[in-house]
Interface confidence: low
């Protein structure tokens, strides 16, 4: 699987999850998030050669098409597969609120 | 929606479904498919600016991050959302076989 366990330990050029730390205030301008200050959102990147973790029949077809027609601009792209939530603390006035934001952390990628 | 109805009628630079005709024999080397000779597989391409058809909270966050950090290599990618099957005819010996291949035609795209 193209997950954090594999991708963070290997110098993998092809589609894989990459570490990306996002600071809420500096990177997003989100001053309203009190805790955490930031988090590892991660992201997916890298080429999608033929059959690499193909998501659908279409991505398999497109991968083969791209191999045989490398000048074509049509090719699968490396995108998130499994995502996890992130719990944040923010304030409404002086009242603390805890909320779980869904699909915030990329754990694995696929070629779609 | 970034579907064929919208995308094929507009000169849309951002993420959209694009027409792509694939000839089974010439483009894929699939000589075993008897009918059809080819089909419109289509593909997704185009930039994913902040909030454009964002698939998840992560793609929204990544879009904003990329807007505020344009030098970053992390950004959402335009990938298939809705796919449709394709019915094909092939032969096993002299026996004709009809099969429906799932997820063969891209009908709409999203930023993931």
């Amino acid at each position: 699987a193209l997950d954090t366990n594999y991708c963070f330990r290997n110098l993998e050029e092809n589609c894989c999850v990459r570490p990306l730390y996002i600071d809420f205030r500096q990177d997003l301008g989100w001053k309203w998030v009190h805790e955490p200050k930031g988090y590892y959102a991660n992201f997916c990147s890298g080429p999608c050669p033929y059959l690499r973790s193909a998501d659908t029949t279409h991505s398999t077809v497109l991968g083969l098409y791209n191999t045989l027609n490398p000048e074509a601009s049509a090719s699968p792209c490396c995108v998130p597969q499994d995502l996890e939530p992130l719990t944040i603390l923010y304030y409404v006035g002086r009242t603390p609120k805890v909320e779980q934001l869904s699909n915030m952390v990329v754990k694995s990628c696929k070629c779609s | 929606a970034l579907d064929t109805n919208y995308c094929f009628r507009n000169l849309e630079e951002n993420c959209c479904v694009r027409p792509l005709y694939i000839d089974f024999r010439q483009d894929l080397g699939w000589k075993w498919v008897h009918e059809p000779k080819g089909y419109y597989a289509n593909f997704c391409s185009g930039p994913c600016p902040y909030l454009r058809s964002a698939d998840t909270t992560h793609s929204t966050v990544l879009g904003l991050y990329n807007t505020l950090n344009p030098e970053a290599s992390a950004s959402p990618c335009c990938v298939p959302q809705d796919l449709e099957p394709l019915t094909i005819l092939y032969y096993v010996g002299r026996t004709p076989k009809v099969e429906q291949l799932s997820n063969m035609v891209v009908k709409s795209c999203k930023c993931s």
């Epitope: 050669p49 490398p70 000048e71 601009s73 | -």
Partner: antibody
């Protein structure tokens, strides 16, 4: 650092054969397309062909038949086999990688980068 | 087979002057923008300056710019620096033809 280094050049007689090697480092041949380009002394650049990351080789029409491109991904090497060499094949031979544009192999935009330093092939009796 | 014609063959200019180099393709390049520009100095391999007709490669000074689409392309050097005197080549990518790539004959930019 991503690098390509050619080797195998030298003096060869007309009608002879030669195999050039392109050793790559810093990237995987299963992810990138590698081209061969040549340049005759005092002349312009001429595209010979490439081998794609998937293993398919494509050639310029003039090179088809005499020149063969192959690779050994395990050895991180791309090869150019040249047969029936002529005086007009005298040139510096470069290997160059397709640059990766975007997060997927969306086409190289005709961008070759990086390049090797080149190796000189002289065809003469 | 596509042919790329560069003009002029030689351009004699002084440092500080503007240089305009032309590249014309006998057929449209793939996607109308698969066109690159390279700089080459004696005894060195070519150096990629611009790809996709107008995108500057990282580390290339912004006095270099590329424009054009389809069959007609231009490389402009706004103010020539001493290190810019070299030979410049354009290269095009093509789909459907046996020759996937072609280089122009080159333009030599020399000191007047």
């Amino acid at each position: 650092e991503q690098q390509l280094v050619e080797s195998g050049g030298g003096l060869v007689q007309p009608g002879g054969s030669l195999r050039l090697s392109c050793a790559v480092s810093g990237f995987s041949l299963s992810s990138y397309t590698v081209n061969w380009v040549r340049q005759a002394p005092g002349k312009g650049l001429e595209w010979i062909g490439y081998i794609s990351y998937g293993g398919s080789a494509y050639y310029a029409s003039w090179a088809n038949g005499r020149f063969t491109i192959s690779k050994d991904s395990a050895k991180n090497s791309v090869y150019l086999q040249m047969n029936s060499l002529r005086a007009e094949d005298t040139a510096v031979y470069f290997c160059a990688r397709h640059m990766q544009v975007g997060g997927a192999p969306t086409g190289s935009m005709a961008a070759f980068d990086p390049w090797g330093p080149g190796t000189l092939v002289t065809v003469s009796s | 087979e596509a042919v790329l014609t560069q003009s002029p063959g030689t351009l004699s200019l002084s440092p500080g002057e503007r240089a305009t180099l032309s590249c014309q393709s006998s057929q449209s390049v793939y996607n109308n923008n698969y066109l690159s520009w390279f700089q080459q100095k004696p005894g060195q391999p070519p150096r990629l300056l611009i790809y996709g007709a107008s995108t500057l490669t990282s580390g290339v000074p912004d006095r270099f710019s590329g424009s054009g689409s389809g069959t007609d392309f231009t490389l402009t050097i706004s103010r020539l620096e001493p290190e810019d005197f070299a030979v410049y080549y354009c290269a095009g990518g093509y789909s459907g033809s046996s020759d996937k790539y072609a280089f122009g004959g080159g333009t030599k930019v020399e000191i007047k």
